[in-house]
Interface confidence: low
């Protein structure tokens, strides 16, 4: 790779509002922001672990891959990457681990080729509903994004502003139906307790969905029916107790699906019968032979595939006359 070059000018220390304005000066052909490394041959700019507090204004127009990881950006304002001429080739933007806690509406506007965005490992207390759509119209222009990586973006509990984190993220995913072309969505490690019911129906192009290492208890209200292209569904390390008939049927109906269910606290009582029957027949669950019961105590560590209907009982419900208050 070509050796890194740096511009002679010092890194912009202009007021934050200037970062959201479209830079009027076209960068010099070989200009590279201070504190960054640039390779025109590889169309790559890396500004990594530099404690940057704002996006450099003098990014070269050739940039296709931009790494801004390990910085202290805090806020991504509207038009954070808007430039004259525009960064027309920017296809992959990695902002992981840059202490972002706010991403504003239109933060990624004027990036017509942006296909992959990684915001992982940022404590996003305030993700605008219009962060990805750029507009509050009911139907926005389609986003070019095909891969959106949002692993571990949950902020500390005391920074969540008393609102549903799941709802905030989903609002950003659904706004303006801009992400209809999204193929990969990673939402691992976000403490999600539930998945809002309409989210998947509006992401029909998904091939890969990673919800691992969350706290999902149930998929009862989640529909997978529209996701005919879905190839992998990662649900490892959640709090799932059982999958009900509707979910099982929908998963079975997806032509290319592989489902990953390891490390969930399966409850092996009478409600588990349908899932056990399905597991014995289906080919879609990867590693199904290692799924084990967590509850009730007498069933702990039993392998789901080895259970039969006699194993799956429910304690009888006491008649009202015998119930204690």
């Amino acid at each position: 790779s070509s050796s890194p070059t740096s511009s002679a000018s010092s890194f912009s220390s202009s007021a934050p509002f200037l970062a959201s304005a479209v830079s009027a000066q076209p960068p010099l052909p070989d200009q590279c922001p201070a504190l960054c490394e640039c390779s025109e041959a590889a169309r790559t700019v890396k500004c990594v672990n530099r404690n940057l507090t704002e996006v450099p204004t003098d990014l070269p127009a050739y940039v296709r891959n931009l790494f801004l990881t390990g910085n202290q950006l805090a806020v991504l304002p509207a038009g954070a990457f808007a430039r004259r001429p525009p960064l027309a080739e920017l296809a992959a933007l990695n902002l992981s681990g840059s202490r972002l806690d706010e991403v504003r509406a239109g933060a990624f506007e004027h990036l017509p080729s942006l296909r992959q965005l990684d915001l992982s490992h940022n404590p996003l207390a305030d993700l605008s509903p219009f962060a990805f759509s750029g507009s509050n119209a009911s139907v926005s222009a389609p986003s070019p994004l095909v891969e959106l990586i949002l692993n571990h973006i949950v902020p500390p509990e005391d920074e969540r502003q008393n609102r549903s984190f799941e709802g905030m993220v989903v609002a950003a995913l659904l706004a303006g139906r801009a992400l209809q072309g999204l193929r990969r969505l990673e939402l691992a490690s976000n403490h999600f307790l539930y998945l809002p019911r309409d989210v998947l129906a509006q992401l029909p192009s998904l091939r890969h969905l990673d919800l691992s290492n969350n706290s999902l208890v149930s998929l009862t209200y989640v529909s997978f029916r529209n996701l005919t292209h879905l190839e992998s569904l990662h649900l490892e390390d959640n709090a799932l107790k059982v999958l009900h008939n509707g979910t099982l049927a929908e998963l079975q109906g997806l032509p290319h699906i592989r489902v990953f269910l390891d490390n969930n606290p399966w409850v092996c009582d009478c409600h588990m019968a349908d899932m056990v029957t399905w597991l014995k027949e289906t080919e879609v669950v990867q590693g199904k032979d290692r799924l084990t019961c967590a509850y009730p105590e007498k069933m702990r560590n039993r392998v789901l595939l080895e259970l039969n209907s006699a194993d799956l009982d429910c304690d009888p419900i006491l008649p009202p006359s015998l119930q204690t208050s």
Epitope: A91, A92, D118, V146, E186, R207, H234, N263, D289
Partner: antibody, heavy 121, light 107 residues
């Protein structure tokens, strides 16, 4: 049918450069991370580099960092490895492989047949 | 970097034997461990992924177990075609290191 076909190997002098290519077919290329793995003669497998589906994230083994560059052209379904400042210890068969999986685990489910790179004066 | 240590480095066994190969990680890698088989002059082949999932098309005599730092590949009854070199690989860290390999030879 998934197929991966490496090319670009050959004999090169120490300090020289080489670019390997891996032509992919039979799957939705841009939806999968890809990787290069090498094997020196008579030795074990060494993971070299990986790249995410859209090319936005790249990773390198310490032994090649700063000398090798992984990239991909999704419009051509092709993975590349640009190797500069080559050393004798870079002599190996280089395999390209497809990643499958998620955030916490991934695996290489399809491999090419390999291309031999020999660094010698 | 996460280091992977395989043992033994070589092993002689007979057809029909039960064989166990172990792999130890220098830190916890949860279940992000894969096993590959390689025969001379050929590309590696995925056997087991995510510690214990059998790759499609791989015979059921192969099995994997373990999580955290200690993992095992077991071949329940060796067949002639199983004599090869076996590698573990972790994919938990950003650098996806392999073990040094275990060569399984005919006794």
């Amino acid at each position: 049918e998934v197929q991966l076909l490496e090319s670009g190997g050959g004999l090169v002098q120490p300090g020289g450069s080489l670019r390997l290519s891996c032509a992919a077919s039979g799957f939705d290329f841009e939806s999968y991370a890809m990787s290069w793995v090498r094997q020196a003669p008579g030795k074990g497998l060494e993971w070299v580099s990986a790249i995410s589906g859209s090319g936005g994230s790249t990773y390198y083994a310490d032994s090649v960092k700063g000398r090798f560059t992984i990239s991909r052209d999704n419009s051509k379904n092709t993975l590349y490895l640009q190797m500069n400042s080559l050393r004798a210890e870079d002599t190996a068969v280089y395999y390209c492989a497809r990643y499958y999986g998620g955030y916490y685990s991934a695996w290489m489910d399809y491999w090419g047949q390999g291309t031999l790179v020999t660094v010698s004066s | 970097d996460i280091q992977m240590t395989q043992s033994p480095s070589s092993l002689s066994a007979s057809v029909g034997d039960r064989v166990t190969i172990t792999c130890r990680a220098s830190q916890s890698i949860r279940s992000a461990l894969n096993w590959y088989q390689q025969k001379p002059g050929k590309a590696p082949k995925l056997l087991i992924y995510a510690a214990s999932s059998l790759q499609s098309g791989v015979p059921s005599r192969f099995s994997g177990s373990g999580s955290g730092t200690d993992f095992t590949l077991t071949i329940s009854s060796l067949q002639p075609e199983d004599f090869a070199t076996y590698y573990c690989q972790q994919t938990y860290g950003y650098l996806h290191t392999f073990g040094q390999g275990t060569k399984l030879e005919i006794k």
